[in-house]
């Protein structure tokens, strides 16, 4: 484990002549940072800079050009990889003073003149002097304060509720701070707050836009954290709401996003007492241009019944909104004329779903099926086909003579989809053909008999079955069946000799 | 030699309540952030909440949030962890632990069994 | 949250062995990564911090690698007293998570 870095000069505290230089050494094991009294905007006659030498160890060198009053506090130089948010800084320190005889007191910020106590809590009212030796005395409206004072941290004791100011004399000069306003606070368990981001989803060039409420507490502190903000991209603001409750609303914008500004935007509200804090987070993406994805829950070739009602669900994702269309066989489709709907609903925030729908499929809803989704950046479509299901039917059945040779060929047109098969039957003896066990299957490899198959179109089909002789009277059966259903029809195919007496007759 | 060590630790009803202390000695207390960690009988570690050294500063996992409060007394160098509308499935023995290896936990207690049960 | 997944959720090996112990982020923790060793009824021991840091104390068998998202710890010659469960944890931010812990058993 790393020793606690060292510090040159090797004192716990300094007093340095206003106006003149100082500087502060630290050497550590590990890169070492400086934590030191002033902000960043005050902070431009503060210089760090690394410093090589020959002893193996990291030097970090912070250099004040010329010393103020402002520069008195405290100077930690700690290992900067090493340090975990809820462990005190852990490092070596030195307390610098710089005298002012004009400046009695350390500068302060204006939140640093409310103190604010919880339950009866001892406070630190932080009037710092920037000469160790300065006598202070502690004052409210009923006299002087005894409380105890330390000139690095202030008094510190248990106050009641009002203005205080501490009073110095420097070579007979008396000063004065302005008053610090000491407010009771109850502790509340819990911080009630809310974040609201209109939207998630971004391009390039938009505005983010994120608010964080914090609703019956005057005294917050509210911090942001967002992927720009050590550019300082964003641009905050407070807006207090008095009517009907207490709310204050930070908004948080990020003119001009980049895909760099993609990631998780979190405000952490702090109760004034820093006791109770509350945390939400909200994840943002910027897309370098709009986009569209389409994720269809069906295939490419779908079938529907005849008269069934049918559904086809498209989900797309898409941003900016899209515009949601469906064709017919690249026609757009017209709605009123057809038993055909479509809608487009918003799911979420990039999520839509597009339903075709239905109503009652007929043969002539078969066809190729495209939705188009558009928006100002990109275009995407999906097309499929959709067939209807017409179970089979016998349009159909004729016999057709050879003449004198005695053939006979027999004709079966059936419809339907899918596309039927056609099957034969004979039943020889005709006294008995309504019995069902007298009929038989003719098969194709039976001599002097040749069936054959011809699609007419995409739903018809003609199957042909040529007897070659046929001596007595025999019955066809002409069976059409596909996966909705079958038909039968027969027919009587009479012998030619038969046939001219029955003629002469 | 540094030391954690917890108390109150027991058997409750589910939907009551129950504190629990960790006195600490050995180390500058003040300066660090401690935590619970939770280990139900048989199962692995659970990290529960945190408080900042200076108690500016609390977290909780989600399934005590709301329920659970961490708070500690630098002056008597103790952490507390009070429990309320206690579950079944908080049964676990309790330990606390702090430290200041680049987060991780130098310090831990022996730890304390709360049993949650009707 | 960050999830932490650990690989092999036991193993069987012999005193002298080499045994190593993964321990997966699901989001870059760059090298804030702890290994613990637990024995039956006692509190956790830290071995190693900043993903490959000894703690004082800790036998130097013991040695932690890694970074990002992707971590080992690793007993180069594993001795009688190793046996026990080894749990990883984040170290940054909050939740600390831990991993689901790795048994190491006599074979």
């Known amino acids: 484990q790393l020793s606690l870095p060292s510090i040159l000069p090797n004192e716990n505290e300094k007093v340095v002549q206003l106006n003149s230089s100082f500087s502060l050494r630290c050497f550590g094991e590990s890169e070492v940072s400086w934590q030191y009294p002033m902000s960043e905007e005050e902070s431009s006659d503060v210089e760090i800079r690394n410093e090589e030498n020959n002893s193996g160890l990291f030097v970090t060198v912070l250099e004040v050009s010329s010393a103020s009053a402002a520069h008195t506090g405290l100077y930690t130089c700690y290992y900067n990889h090493t340090q975990t948010e809820e462990n005190e800084l852990e490092g070596r320190h030195i307390y610098i003073y710089v005298p002012d005889p004009d400046v009695a007191f350390v500068p302060l910020g204006m939140t640093d003149y409310l103190v604010i106590v919880e339950d009866d809590d001892s406070a630190i009212i932080p009037c710092r002097t920037t000469d160790p030796e300065t006598p202070v005395t502690l004052h409210n409206s009923e006299g002087v304060v005894p409380a105890s004072y330390d000139s690095r941290q202030g008094f510190n004791g248990t106050f009641t509720v009002g203005p205080y100011i501490c009073e110095a004399t420097v070579k007979g000069k008396k000063f004065q701070t302005i008053p610090f306003n000491v407010y009771a606070l109850k502790a509340t368990s819990e911080l009630d707050l809310e974040m609201e981001a209109l939207k998630t989803v971004y391009k390039s060039g938009e505005t983010i836009v994120v608010t964080c409420a914090v609703f019956n507490n005057e005294v917050v502190d509210l911090q942001w954290t967002y992927p720009g903000e050590v550019k300082g991209k964003g641009i905050t603001m407070l807006e207090e709401i008095k009517v009907p409750s207490i709310k204050l609303v930070y908004t948080l914008t990020v003119p001009e996003a980049t895909v760099k500004d993609s990631g998780d935007y979190e405000c952490a509200a702090r109760q004034a007492t820093r006791e109770v804090k509350e945390m939400k987070k909200v994840t943002i993406s910027v897309h370098e241009k709009g986009f569209i994805e389409i994720k269809p829950t069906f295939s490419q070739l779908e079938a529907v019944n005849l008269h069934e009602v049918k559904h086809f669900v498209v989900e797309v994702r898409a941003y900016p909104p899209p515009r949601i269309s469906w064709l017919k066989n690249n026609l757009t489709l017209i709605e009123n004329l057809t038993e055909i709907t479509t809608d487009v609903e918003k799911i979420q925030e990039i999520r839509y779903r597009s339903k075709l729908k239905l109503i009652r499929a007929k043969e002539e809803d078969s066809g190729h099926y495209t939705i188009v989704a558009q928006n100002e950046d990109a275009v995407k479509s999906y097309t499929f086909e959709l067939l209807t299901q017409v179970p089979s039917s016998i349009l159909d059945l004729v016999d057709d003579h050879h003449g004198s040779t005695g053939g006979q060929t027999v004709r079966c047109t059936a419809e339907g989809t899918p596309l039927p098969d056609i099957e034969w039957m004979i039943c020889k003896d005709i006294k008995k053909c309504n019995n069902e066990t007298s009929w038989t299957i003719l098969a194709n490899n039976v001599s002097n008999i040749i069936t054959e198959i011809h699609s007419r179109d995409r739903s018809t089909v003609e199957g042909r079955v040529t007897f070659a002789k046929v001596e007595e009277t025999i019955a066809v059966r002409c069976l059409a069946k596909n996966l909705l259903g079958a038909e039968n029809r027969e027919l009587k195919l009479v012998a030619p000799t038969l046939r001219s007496e029955l003629t002469v007759a | 030699q540094v030391q954690l060590v917890e108390s109150g630790g027991g058997v409750v009803q589910p939907g009551r309540s129950l504190r629990l202390s960790c006195a600490a000695s050995?180390?500058?207390?003040?300066?660090?952030?401690m935590h619970w960690v939770r280990q139900a009988p048989g199962k692995g570690l659970e990290w529960v909440a945190v408080i900042w050294y200076d108690r500016s500063n609390k977290y909780y996992v989600d399934s005590v949030k709301g329920r659970f409060t961490i708070s500690r007394d630098n002056s008597k160098n103790t952490l507390y962890l009070q429990m309320n509308s206690l579950r079944a499935e908080d049964t676990a023995v309790y330990y606390c632990a702090g430290g200041r290896s680049r987060g991780a936990f130098d310090y831990w207690g022996q730890g304390t069994l709360v049993t949650v049960s009707s | 949250d960050i999830q932490m997944t650990q690989s092999p959720s036991s193993v069987s090996a012999s005193v002298g062995d080499r045994v190593t112990i993964t321990c997966r982020a699901s989001q870059d923790i760059s090298s804030w990564l702890a290994w613990y060793q637990q024995k039956p009824g006692k509190a956790p021991k830290l071995l190693i911090f900043?993903?490959?840091s000894l703690q004082s104390g800790v036998p130097s068998r013991f040695s932690g690698s890694g970074s990002g998202t992707d971590f080992t710890l690793t007993i180069s010659s594993l001795q009688p007293e190793d046996f026990a469960t080894y749990y990883c944890?984040?170290?940054?931010?909050?939740?600390?998570?831990f991993g689901q812990g790795t048994k190491v058993e006599i074979k």
């Open positions: 944890q984040r170290t940054s931010s909050f939740p600390r998570t």
């Open positions: 900043a993903a490959s």
């Open positions: 050995g180390f500058t207390f003040s300066s660090y952030g």
